[in-house]
């Protein structure tokens, strides 16, 4: 249990179009040092959704910004969800490296399904 685990506790999350999707992720340790990133999809074609270290992600809010509770919570909320946002999202821990950070461990993924906007 000493080695870092990336926990994505939900296998699937459902949200109505136009609302915000909350995707949960927790780490069991702060070691190794390095950023967290969120991706949609896996493999070479995956899409970066959020990078803790750098970048501008106007639709993403980190839940820990709201709670100020602890630094092991890397859950995010993505605003203004559309059907195009459906897919499997992965929370990925990177290990600090030089010149580039190295992927260390990924969560199991959470499938986001988008319901039609309530009439």
């Amino acid at each position: 249990e000493d080695e870092l685990q990336v926990i994505q506790p939900e296998k699937s999350v459902s949200v109505a179009a136009g609302e915000s999707a909350t995707l949960r992720c927790a780490m069991t340790s702060l070691i190794p040092v390095g950023p967290i990133m969120w991706f949609r999809g896996a493999g070479a074609g995956r899409e970066l959704i959020y990078n803790q270290k750098e970048g501008h992600f106007p639709r993403v809010t980190t839940v820990s910004e709201l709670t100020k509770r602890n630094n092991l919570d890397f859950s995010i909320s993505i605003s203004n969800i559309t059907p195009a946002d459906a897919g499997t999202y992965y929370c990925v821990k990177f290990r600090k490296g030089s010149p580039d950070d190295v992927e260390f461990k990924s969560g199991a993924g959470t499938e986001l399904s988008v319901r039609a906007k309530p009439s």
Epitope: I7, E19, S77
Partner: antibody, heavy 121, light 108 residues
Framework: QVQLQESGPGLVKPSQTLSLTCTVS??????????WSWIRQHPGKGLEWIGY???????VYNPSLKSRVTISVDTSKNQFSLKLSSVTAADTAVYYC?????????????WGQGTLVTVSS | EIVLTQSPGTLSLSPGERATLSCRAS???????LAWYQQKPGQAPRLLIY???SRATGIPDRFSGSGSGTDFTLTISRLEPEDFAVYYC?????????FGGGTKVENQ
């Protein structure tokens, strides 16, 4: 401190839809990082988690009930609700609402006092 | 889903005695994701322990939690009359969140 209170009919007919509401007082349901759950307990039995909603609308359901469950939130009323369709006698239980979070470690606290729903014709 | 098995089902003890309750998970559960609750007849469950070993606010220090991986323990060092109740463990590691079947601590 935050308090939760369940309300709704205590008797539902088989095949109908069970509807319950949980009213949150002493705090805002829109406070980030909290997840608002429904949990039930069959008479004399253990606890079964039904599902949760985040204030923004994200829902997660227990797969065993997913096809029959809808949880919704009304932030303007500081309430969240449970609908369980096509009920049978096996859905007779005490239904609790509870708050989870924020962050990790996680836990359910506080809980509502619970409301008994009986499914019978 | 993660199955939590609590033992014994019933524990018959006298006030002042030590109670040791076990919770075994069907797969490894990081300690941050394990909680214990107490339930008395006609009442809602009450949080006792979170993160496997942290006492909730207002919980007396005679209650303690320990364990990691698949084996967790709730210990009541000296039973008080108000401690006779049913105790549940619960995990948040993987949805659906699940509870153990409970251990009833009764007055012998």
């Amino acid at each position: 401190q935050v308090q939760l209170q369940e309300s709704g009919p205590g008797l539902v007919k088989p095949s109908q839809t069970l509807s319950l509401t949980c009213t949150v007082s002493g705090g805002s349901i829109s406070s980030g990082g909290y997840y608002w759950s429904w949990i039930r307990q069959h008479p004399g039995k253990g606890l079964e988690w039904i599902g949760y909603i985040y204030y923004s609308g994200s829902t997660v359901y227990n797969p065993s009930l997913k096809s029959r469950v809808t949880i919704s939130v009304d932030t303007s009323k500081n309430q969240f609700s449970l609908k369980l369709s096509s009920v049978t006698a096996a859905d007779t239980a005490v239904y609790y609402c509870a708050r989870e979070g924020p962050g990790y470690p996680s836990y359910f606290d506080p809980w509502g006092q619970g409301t008994l729903v009986t499914v019978s014709s | 889903e993660i199955v939590l098995t609590q033992s014994p089902g019933t524990l018959s003890l006298s006030p002042g005695e030590r109670a040791t309750l076990s919770c075994r998970a069907s797969q490894s559960v990081s300690s941050s994701f394990l909680a214990w609750y107490q339930q008395k007849p006609g009442q809602a469950p009450r949080l006792l322990i979170y993160g496997a070993s942290s006492r909730a606010t207002g919980i007396p220090d005679r209650f303690s939690g320990s364990g990691s991986g698949t084996d967790f323990t709730l210990t009541i060092s000296r039973l008080e009359p108000e401690d006779f109740a049913v105790y549940y463990c619960q995990q948040f590691l993987s949805s659906p969140w699940t509870f153990g079947g409970g251990t009833k601590v009764e007055n012998q």
